[in-house]
């Protein structure tokens, strides 16, 4: 099955890579514009420059385009913890991350929310922190993992998961009620 | 105690709008980032907005974009979610919750409201 194009692909590729078909004269290709610049007058006629002007500050555009508009350069999220790694140039987006010993959340494809890596205090460190991931713990004996902390098994209720690695401890309880005087 | 409270849900036509209300109690609203996430029949959690404490600072998913609009009142510590032409797709349980700051699950989330967007 050949994939469908969209019209302006469709023009596209009528041209030779790096130009891109005239939008009022299908016989003219015009050179694209480099990045760092945008689309201000298509060109003229066949072999005859295409009109390009440099992105404003606070915009850019990352790669060859004939778009009409440079993008506007996106902004950390002060409330999701981003701080800016590299700020914005006519040909680069401002790159956002997170600091040290954080790591960074994704709620969404294009939303990242920075949080602190787990210490695994009363565990051990099964994988370290990596820029997408938090720590992996492994919870020593008498612990049991929680939204990634190692909590102690007489946080642990019969009802929850943690009955299983808690289990001697469970009947421990259990029997210090039991042996209540009557 | 931290409470959450949504209402406005209910049954509405494709292209109609509707304001969903989150009020907040047992928590310094004006000191945290709230949220709209909605869970879909049979689908996960999907973060619909966001807004920061002084309500200058918003995000919205692609899916809401131009259609909803999120804002809050801090002196009647209230969250809005106005959602205008609607969508079958937007068929959801609708949740307000506070920003999770200790790792990436929802310490409050209220009990949510449902909307359904049908003929």
């Known amino acids: 099955l050949v994939p469908h194009l969209g019209d302006r692909e469709k023009r596209d590729s009528v041209c030779p890579q790096g130009k891109y078909i005239h939008p009022q004269n299908n016989s003219i290709c015009c050179t694209k514009c480099h990045k760092g610049t945008y689309l201000y007058n298509d060109c003229p006629g066949p072999g005859q420059d295409t009109d390009c002007r440099e992105c404003e500050s606070g915009s850019f555009t990352a790669s060859e385009n004939h778009l009409r508009h440079c993008l506007s350069c996106s902004k950390c999220r002060k409330e999701m913890g981003q701080v800016e790694i590299s700020s914005c140039t006519v040909d680069r987006d401002t790159v956002c991350g997170c600091r040290k010993n954080q790591y960074r959340h994704y709620w969404s494809e294009n939303l990242f929310q920075c949080f602190n890596c787990s210490l695994c205090l009363n565990g051990t460190v099964h994988l370290s922190c990596q820029e997408k991931q938090n720590t992996v713990c492994t919870c020593h004996a008498g612990f049991f993992l929680r939204e990634n902390e190692c909590v102690s098994c007489s946080n642990c209720k019969k009802s929850l998961e943690c009955t299983k690695l808690c289990l001697p401890q469970i009947e421990n309880v259990k029997g210090t009620e039991d042996s209540g005087t009557t | 105690e931290v409470q959450l409270l949504e209402s406005g849900g209910g049954l509405i036509q494709p292209g109609g709008s509707l304001r969903l209300t989150c009020a907040a109690s047992?928590?310094?609203?004006?000191?945290?980032?709230m949220v709209w996430v909605r869970q879909a029949p049979g689908k996960g959690l999907e973060w619909v907005s966001h807004?920061?404490?002084?309500?200058?600072?918003?995000y919205y998913a692609d899916s809401v974009k131009g259609r909803f609009t999120i804002s809050r009142d801090n002196s009647k510590n209230t969250l809005y979610l106005q959602m205008n032409s609607l969508r079958a797709e937007d068929t959801a349980v609708y949740y307000c919750?506070?920003?999770?700051?200790?790792?990436?699950?929802?310490?409050?989330r209220g009990q949510g409201t449902l909307v359904t967007v049908s003929s």
């Open positions: 919750a506070v920003l999770p700051k200790r790792g990436p699950w929802f310490d409050y």
């Open positions: 047992g928590f310094t609203f004006a000191h945290e980032t």
């Open positions: 807004i920061d404490r002084v309500g200058q600072d918003t």
